[in-house]
């Protein structure tokens, strides 16, 4: 393990922090979990706790940001450099920041909470087996009522459990609706919608109206980000993949490798690639927040990186579902910190 | 010992282009970002280019925006600087350094070693 | 982008004299400023990272002081090797940007 200079660290043991704001890649309670867990990790190991306040004096700030987002350390867009960190002290020493051109997951793909169905809630499991084929995103697959539906296990076929996905046609959000879900078509502005729009809105958030005549009704919902199928890169960054659609006269209601020579995975953005050319990849398998954001807590508290490749702090993103801290990494914070003390003995107690 | 070795500079017409090199050594320098910086005669300090580590993310001055191209060969140890349309006003000592911080260790501030420059010069 | 003022633009000091050299930012830039000395002819050399870290081989006379807009660079005791320019530089913001300079020089 390494520290940086002088043992940079903190003075007191009671750290707070703040999430300044949120990445749209998951949910804001995942997000919650995801650093609550990461911090838990060191205060197993240390006298330290670690406290969520909701104001700009906390000791860690977290925020998400791209590009340059206001300290002297740009960010370099997906991959490369996926978070930074800045050692103990005031201000924005102690900071960590997120690279929000990343895929932010738990390093297993993204993260789609399901509805409804028969899986209490838990989030989708990609791929899954349906009938056979694999699926890398929600799917209309096997419904009449075009409602997009995800296995919360890898085999659909033997397991059976499935929920609904984020979609307009279930339900909307914030908006004046109480969550009723899209009435397609409507009317705005004397115009047919048959989709979400952006249009009348500058900040590019997509809405639907959950009656037929918004012009009339007023009445109007935000549409859930679809993360599973929401493109990066290709020609339409940002789009939503159209299932069916079809290439080489081919129908695909999945995210397909055909056509590449790289194995990488892509839908049209549009039903009919042949002739609109309009695509991008499909979502990866995304980098751990939970685990990127331990290694820069480690930073946040006073660790430099460290030369042992199995540590949480050695400078290289890698995926494990095993404990994330190797005995460097606690030698190294208890050097700082000290151990976590033993809890007092108690007298035995009489009835 | 840290060690920076530039080369290429010399006298080139406006409108020319020149490829300067930065040859690294005692150090791991894929695991740092790079930077050129360029003092004109008798002037200050302006930083010109940065590439991050990984070697994909690349930042330029405005002055330079469009007309330089900075990069980078980690298995040479080796930095560049290619510039093409060049200007007088390009006239200046180029000295590539080396940043203290790497990937996401930051806040540490401060350029640890310098190249000895190389000096170009843009006149007709 | 932070500009950064360098004050005074010259100063003559005599060796054994304690010099102060300052550096103002246009706004806060916490203490992300590194100061450097630059001799004719020669490559700038880091002396002060992060407003007050000593670099590596810097002598104990060099000190550096300062967070927000205001910063100083001192050397207690001048040494004859110590006559040069000096800037300061930051990185609280994006872009970097390099102070315009201090000459320290002889009286």
């Known amino acids: 393990f390494q520290t940086f200079e002088g043992d940079l660290k903190w003075h007191h043991h009671n750290i707070t922090y703040w999430i300044q704001n949120y990445s749209e890649d998951l949910p804001r309670a995942v997000i919650d979990d995801a650093f609550a867990r990461a911090f838990a990790l060191w205060s197993a190991v240390t006298p330290l706790t670690f406290t969520r306040v909701y104001s700009r004096d906390a000791d860690i700030v977290i925020q998400f940001g791209v590009a340059e987002h206001g300290d002297g350390y740009p960010f370099d867009g997906k991959d490369g450099l996926l978070a930074h960190a800045f050692p103990p002290g005031p201000g924005i020493q102690g900071d960590a920041h997120f690279d929000d051109d990343e895929l932010w997951s738990l390093g297993k793909g993204v993260v789609v909470p399901t509805r409804f169905g028969n899986a209490d809630g838990a989030a989708c499991h990609f791929p899954f087996i349906f009938e056979g084929r694999s699926y890398s995103a929600c799917t209309t697959d096997g419904r009449s009522d075009g409602l997009p539906w995800c296995s919360t296990t890898a085999n659909y076929d033997t397991d059976d459990r499935f929920g609904f996905c984020p979609s307009e046609r279930l339900y909307t959000q914030d908006g004046n609706a109480d969550g009723k879900p899209c009435q397609f078509p409507f009317i705005f502005q004397g115009q047919s919608y048959s989709a979400c729009t952006t249009d009348g809105r500058s900040d590019g958030y997509r809405w639907c109206a959950t009656t037929a005549n918004y012009d009339r009704d007023k009445l109007f919902g935000f549409c859930p980000t679809r993360a599973d199928s929401t493109v990066m890169g290709g020609n339409s960054a940002g789009e939503l993949c159209v299932f069916p659609f079809t290439f080489l006269g081919k129908e695909y209601s999945t995210c397909t490798s055909e056509g590449r020579g790289d194995g990488r995975l892509w839908c049209a953005t549009t039903s009919n690639f042949d002739s609109d050319k309009k695509w991008g990849f499909c979502p990866d398998q995304g980098y751990s927040l939970f685990l990127v954001a331990a290694h820069e807590f480690g930073h946040a508290l006073g660790l430099d990186h460290s030369s042992v490749p199995e540590a949480l702090m050695y400078p290289m993103y890698r995926f494990t579902e095993g404990p994330p801290l190797h005995k460097d990494d606690v030698n190294g914070i208890r050097h700082l910190y000290g151990p976590r003390p033993e809890p007092e003995p108690r007298p035995p107690t009489t009835t | 010992e840290v060690q920076l070795l530039e080369s290429g500079g010399g006298l080139v017409q406006p409108g020319g282009s020149l490829r300067l090199s930065c040859a690294a050594s005692?150090?791991?320098?894929?695991?740092?970002d790079m930077w050129w910086v360029r003092q004109a005669p008798g002037k200050g300090l302006e930083w010109v280019s940065v590439i991050y580590s990984s070697g994909g993310p690349t930042f330029y001055a405005d002055s330079v925006k469009g007309r330089f191209t900075i990069s980078r060969d980690n298995s040479k140890n080796t930095l560049y600087l290619q510039m093409n349309s060049l200007r007088a006003e390009d006239t200046a000592v180029y000295y590539c350094?080396?940043?203290?911080?790497?990937?996401?260790?930051?806040?540490?501030?401060?350029?640890?070693?310098w190249g000895q420059g190389t000096l170009v010069t843009v006149s007709s | 982008e932070i500009v950064l003022t360098q004050s005074p633009a010259t100063l003559s000091l005599s060796p054994g004299e304690r010099a102060t050299l300052s550096c103002r930012a246009s706004?806060?830039?916490?203490?992300?400023l590194a100061w450097y000395q630059q001799k004719p002819g020669q490559a700038p050399r880091l002396l002060i990272y992060d407003a007050s870290y000593r670099a590596t081989g810097i002598p104990a006379r060099f000190s550096g002081s300062g967070s927000g807009t205001d910063f100083t660079l001192t050397i207690s005791s001048l040494e004859p090797e110590d006559f040069a320019v000096y800037y300061c530089q930051q990185r609280g913001n994006w872009p970097i940007t390099f102070g315009q300079g201090t000459r320290l020089e002889i009286k």
């Open positions: 706004q806060s830039i916490s203490s992300f």
């Open positions: 005692g150090f791991t320098f894929s695991w740092y």
């Open positions: 350094a080396k940043d203290r911080a790497y990937g996401d260790y930051v806040g540490w501030n401060g350029f640890d070693y």
